[in-house]
Interface confidence: low
């Protein structure tokens, strides 16, 4: 993400839908584009491009050597270089990148979906648990926030596209192998009832499995790795 934060057309960790909304704001003209953080690929990006009044999305993978490429395409030193190249050469894209859609004044790249997600989960949790609405809901959110944040942080992963619940090892392999075979493609599944997980990662066409254990204090880590309070933090790291 550091390699793109300086770009005026980089929106950070926005969703595909948000990207499309921005492109609509920009007039949806052919070749209008923006860059965002990939939610599926570690260190990757996504390029959203308007063409024929429709948004088209391309995954930009970060290769092991630190270069960036659209699946099957030419490697570039940075996301900016990639966008510059595709402004002169479509090379598999639906059209040339003609005009970057810049962040509106005062808008910073979104640092990650967790903050927004956390707000939404807290709101939903309070709403459903205490059946509140309006001002009473807002007041309850403010008063309960510190306690709720910890609870929400530990379950936030369940809402993430990379968390696949209690699927089998075989199913997890099939899922990362389907579609593009890109380095860094991953998912996490629940292993058993002890609160442990497994990371299923695609690397050079091979599926690698890593155990994510929970220690006595409740912290999560890949064996011999750094410990995290939540699955969310482990993945973000």
């Amino acid at each position: 993400v550091d390699s793109a934060n300086h770009l005026t057309y980089f929106f950070g960790n926005i969703t595909r839908e948000e990207a499309e909304d921005y492109l609509v704001q920009g007039g949806m003209t052919d070749g209008l584009y923006l860059l965002r953080q990939s939610r599926n690929y570690l260190g990757g990006f996504a390029l959203s491009v308007a063409h024929n009044r429709k948004a088209h999305h391309y995954t930009i993978e970060r290769e092991l050597n630190g270069t960036y490429a659209i699946s099957g395409g030419r490697a570039h030193a940075s996301p900016a270089d990639l966008c510059h190249y595709h402004s002169q050469e479509p090379d598999g894209l639906i059209c040339l990148l003609k005009k970057p859609f810049n962040r509106p004044p005062g808008v910073q790249p979104k640092t990650g979906p967790f903050e927004d997600l956390k707000e939404n989960l807290i709101r939903e949790y309070v709403k459903q648990t205490w059946n509140l609405q309006g001002q009473a809901l807002e007041q309850a959110i403010i008063s309960q926030k510190p306690q709720l944040e910890k609870l929400i942080a530990t379950t936030a992963h369940e809402k993430m596209p990379w968390f696949h619940g209690n699927i089998s090892r075989d199913e997890s392999e099939q899922t990362v192998l389907i579609g593009s075979k890109t380095n860094g493609k991953f998912l996490i599944r629940a292993r058993d009832n002890s609160g442990s997980y497994a990371l299923c990662l695609l690397h050079e066409g091979k599926v690698l499995h890593y155990r994510i254990d929970r220690d006595k204090t409740g912290k999560l880590s890949i064996p011999e790795g750094k410990k995290f309070d939540t699955l969310w933090q482990l993945v973000e790291h």
């Epitope: 075989d170 199913e171 099939q174 579609g179 075979k181």
Partner: antibody, heavy 115, light 111 residues
């Protein structure tokens, strides 16, 4: 034990839209990744039509893509197939199946396209 | 014309070992898992082998799968009359971005 049951009209007129539903029992449709449709013309081999992921994203056979829509209804624990602008060539037994590797299959339903 | 190539027919006598081949390319069998299905007359296909050589529970160990390069094969040992069926291989194809099937092999148990 997972069970899949296809349902829908056995006869469809040419140029109409074929609509089938696959009811899933003994398994939550939200728990497994992929749900698919496969067809088999009489006396011929198997042809994959498409997959739907429980979140709603889809993969379709490129040769059928322009005519196919697969959707999922988690509340009813079922998923559906729509195939538009059918011709006699779409006459086949249609199967629904679970998982990328089609681990479980429905018993199939014969759909005949004829006027 | 199927993407994966299987012999249209195969036969054997009870007790014999029969092998069915499935030939593909680097974009399917060469880089992906192979699946085998058995379709008894008038019934839906049933998964026989997944991930090249794994058997689902309930499938007898008389059935085994293997893969080498861009080809795969299904072996049935101790052939029985109830094994008479159509057998299909399948694999994901990277180029087509879809699963592809073989044309099927009709296995006849003689005698």
């Amino acid at each position: 034990q997972v069970q899949l049951q296809e349902s829908g009209p056995g006869l469809v007129k040419p140029s109409d839209t074929l609509s089938l539903t696959c009811a899933v029992s003994g398994y939550s449709i939200s728990s497994s990744n992929w749900w698919g449709w496969i067809r088999q013309p009489p006396g011929k081999g198997l042809e994959w039509i498409g997959y739907i992921y429980h979140s709603g994203s889809t993969y379709y056979n490129p040769s059928l893509k322009s005519r196919v829509t697969i959707s999922v209804d988690k509340s009813k624990n079922q998923f559906s197939l729509k195939l538009s602008s059918v011709t006699a060539a779409d006459t086949a037994v249609y199967y629904c199946a679970r998982n990328v590797g089609f681990h479980d299959w429905g018993q199939g339903t014969l759909v005949t396209v004829s006027s | 014309q199927s993407v994966l190539t299987q012999p249209p027919s195969a036969s054997g006598t009870p007790g014999q070992r029969v092998t069915i081949s499935c030939s593909g390319s680097s974009s399917n069998i060469g880089s992906n898992y192979v699946y085998w299905y058995q379709q008894l007359p008038g019934t839906a296909p049933k998964l026989l082998i997944y991930r090249n050589n794994q058997r689902p529970s309930g499938v007898p160990d008389r059935f085994s799968g293997s893969k080498s390069g861009t080809s795969a094969s299904l072996a049935i040992s101790g052939l029985r009359s109830e094994d008479e069926a159509d057998y299909y291989c399948a694999a994901w194809d990277d180029s087509l971005a879809s699963p592809v099937f073989g044309g099927g092999t009709k296995l006849t148990v003689l005698g």
